[in-house]
Interface confidence: medium
């Protein structure tokens, strides 16, 4: 396997693209349980309807790979879990991709990403004891091709869930 | 250790204004959500409103929209309610919880009392 982009060994702030800029995706670091930092990125807007939160990646180098795999471990609240919380919660999120030739597009449109999955917690997950708390860690793998451009961007959409998404990491596998 | 101490709570008219802290220690605060619920006297627990991580995004009751708000300084590990216009049916016990985006455990204060009666 060859990693094309690992969010766990990024130094510093991730600085992904979060629209809308406030009230939606947040970059929020938390302790692992070496006292490490891990940049994550959170969301829980679970009492408004018709949440659409996106967080895009920096651009990532397909490095002539037909065929790439996503991995993304994250975390997903139960609605049930959360008090007063009413049918606006949801329990998916949504994983997008948009290839490009250009590493420093500023904007790009919703409709421009194509649809790789709709992402739900499953029954299996590890447990993470980060100090304070207990992160039930959910581990989802994507491929995505063929890809033609000489990169891509990610991106992840929110519609009202609870998540933090804790590494992300892409990744090839060499004939 | 962890704790979550409410303040501010009292009797007022109605009409009045209150405003709630809630002091958090023992955990990494600026990590989670904040949440005020309160419970009337009989009744179970009515979500009330949440601020997230950095305080830029809020959310209300229908019930409360307009006349509460919630605000954070992750300085202070501090979370606020400043409650106007105050209402005979606001009074209960209100009680702020913090909780993350994608782990527990949640975390609960002890509550403090509103009583808004003439």
């Known amino acids: 396997e060859v990693t094309l982009l690992d969010s766990r060994s990024v130094q510093g702030e991730l600085g992904w693209i979060a629209s809308p800029l406030e009230g939606g995706w947040e970059e929020v670091s938390i302790m692992d349980e070496k006292n490490t930092p891990i940049r994550t990125y959170q969301v829980c807007n679970v009492m408004e309807p018709s949440q659409n939160n996106w967080l895009r990646t920096d651009w990532i180098t397909r490095e002539g790979a037909q065929r790439v795999y996503i991995e993304i471990k994250f975390t997903l609240r139960d609605c049930n879990s959360l008090p007063g919380v009413m049918g606006t919660c949801k329990e998916t999120f949504n994983l997008y991709y948009y290839e490009s030739d250009n590493d420093k597009e500023r904007f790009i449109r919703e409709n421009q990403f194509v649809k790789i999955d709709t992402i739900a917690a499953d029954e299996s997950f590890t447990q993470v004891d980060i100090g304070d708390r207990i992160m039930k860690l959910n581990t989802e793998i994507r491929d995505v091709g063929p890809l033609s451009k000489k990169g891509f961007y990610l991106a992840f959409q929110d519609v009202g869930a609870c998540i933090a998404l804790v590494s992300v990491r892409v990744f090839y596998k060499k004939a | 250790q962890v704790q979550l101490q409410e303040s501010g709570g009292g009797l007022v008219q109605p009409g009045g204004s209150l405003r709630l802290s809630c002091a958090a220690s023992g955990f990494t605060f600026s990590s989670y959500y904040m949440y005020w619920v309160r419970q009337a006297p009989g009744k179970g627990l009515e979500w009330v409103s949440t601020?997230?991580?950095?305080?830029?995004?809020?959310n209300y009751a229908d019930s409360v929209k307009g006349r509460f708000i919630i605000s954070r300084d992750n300085a202070k590990n501090t979370v606020y309610l400043q409650m106007n216009s105050l209402k005979p049916e606001d009074t209960a016990v209100y009680y702020c919880?913090?909780?993350?985006?994608?782990?527990?455990?949640?975390?609960w204060g002890q509550g403090t009392q509103v009583t808004v009666s003439s």
């Open positions: 601020i997230n991580t950095g305080g830029g995004s809020t």
């Open positions: 919880n913090a909780f993350a985006a994608g782990w527990g455990p949640d975390y």
